[in-house]
Amino acid sequence: ALDTNYCFSSTEKNCCVRQLYIDFRKDLGWKWIHEPKGYHANFCLGPCPYIWSLDTQYSKVLALYNQHNPGASAAPCCVPQALEPLPIVYYVGRKPKVEQLSNMIVRSCKCS
Amino acid sequence: ALDTNYCFSSTEKNCCVRQLYIDFRKDLGWKWIHEPKGYHANFCLGPCPYIWSLDTQYSKVLALYNQHNPGASAAPCCVPQALEPLPIVYYVGRKPKVEQLSNMIVRSCKCS
């Protein structure tokens, strides 16, 4: 699996999850989240050659098409597969509220 | 929706489904499919700016991050959303077989 366990401990050039820290204020302009100040969102990056963690029959077809037509702009793309929630603290007036923001952290990637 | 109805009739620069015809022999090297000889597979292409058909909360975050950090390599990618099957004819010996190959045709795209 192209997950954090594999990708963070390797020098994989193909599609893999990469480390990315996002600061809510600096990187998103969000002031409403009190905690955390930022988080490890991660992101997916790398080429998707034929047979590399392909998502669907279509992805396989497109990767093979790309192999036969190297100059083509049609190619599978490395995108998130498994996403995890992020617990946050925000304020409603003076009252702190805890909430889980779903689908915020990338744990693994796939070629789609 | 970024589907064939919208995308094929517009000059949309952002993420949209694009026309792509794949010839099984020429483009994939597949000789086993008797009919059809090829098909309109289509593909997804175009940038994914903030608020453009974003798939998850993470996609929104990443698009916003990209807006604040234009040089960053972390950005959402335009990938298939709705896929349709393709009926094919192939031979087992001299006997023709009809089968549906699932997830072969892109009908719409999303930013993931």
């Epitope: 204020r25 009190h34 955390p36 490890h40 617990p87 603290v89 805890v98 | -």
Partner: antibody, heavy 117, light 103 residues
């Protein structure tokens, strides 16, 4: 290299105010929260508050009852902590510390504030 | 405010021994916890952030575990330079309180 360099030791009279500076270098000052922590002699660590230099937003520890004011000068990348109405219980070493990734990763060397009549 | 309770208050051990210090939060803080080492006359030094992540330049004999309300710092094999006071601190809503320290 990230550095936080604090101003020198201070001796103040009871009721007076003290302003401690924390000059930073080696990172983007405006986009990291700066925390202030104090430590009385032989005691533990006490979080006082934080400031976001980019817009001046602050969060304070209520136990200091409005006696603490945090400011930042973005032109010199310097953070300041002012403590008013000083009393004997305020004798401590005061630290500035950069906030990063759910921690304070870089600390100043500390500034000793003594209150004596 | 969130109260951080650290134990034990002090430890006396020999070189090469394994040490575990615990820290309990009065409410769920998820993984928003850091551990620091403070040697006499020095500023605190970050050891562990986000409960389990080793800070840059920190020897691998240090490790952190836990989430929610119960956390621990482990030193797998004590070295003489590990003589210090160790503090935990939460980062789940201000004020960011510290544990009382383990000497």
């Amino acid at each position: 290299e990230v550095q936080l360099v604090q101003s020198g030791a201070e001796v103040k009279k009871p009721g007076a105010s003290v302003k401690v500076s924390c000059k930073t270098s080696g990172y983007t000052f405006i986009s990291s929260w700066m925390n202030w922590v104090r430590q009385a002699p032989g005691a533990g660590l006490d979080w006082m508050g934080q400031i976001y230099p980019g817009d001046g937003d602050t969060n304070y520890n209520g136990k200091f009852k409005g006696r603490v004011t945090l400011t930042a000068d973005t032109s010199t990348s310097t953070a300041y902590m002012e403590l008013s109405s000083l009393r004997a219980g305020d004798i401590a070493v005061y630290y500035c510390a950069r906030h990063y990734d759910g921690s304070t990763d870089y600390w100043g060397q500390g500034t000793l504030v003594t209150v004596s009549s | 405010e969130i109260v951080m309770t650290q134990s034990p208050a002090s430890l006396s051990l020999s070189q090469g021994e394994k040490v575990t210090i615990t820290c309990r939060a009065s409410e769920n803080i998820y993984s928003n916890l850091a551990w620091y080492q403070q040697r006499p006359g020095q500023a605190p030094k970050l050891l562990i952030y986000a409960a389990t992540n080793l800070a840059d330049g920190v020897p691998s004999r240090f490790s952190g575990s836990g989430s929610g309300t119960d956390f621990s710092l482990t030193i797998s094999s004590l070295e003489p330079e590990d003589v210090a006071v160790y503090y935990c601190q939460h980062f789940w809503g201000t004020p960011y309180t510290f544990g009382q320290g383990t000497k």
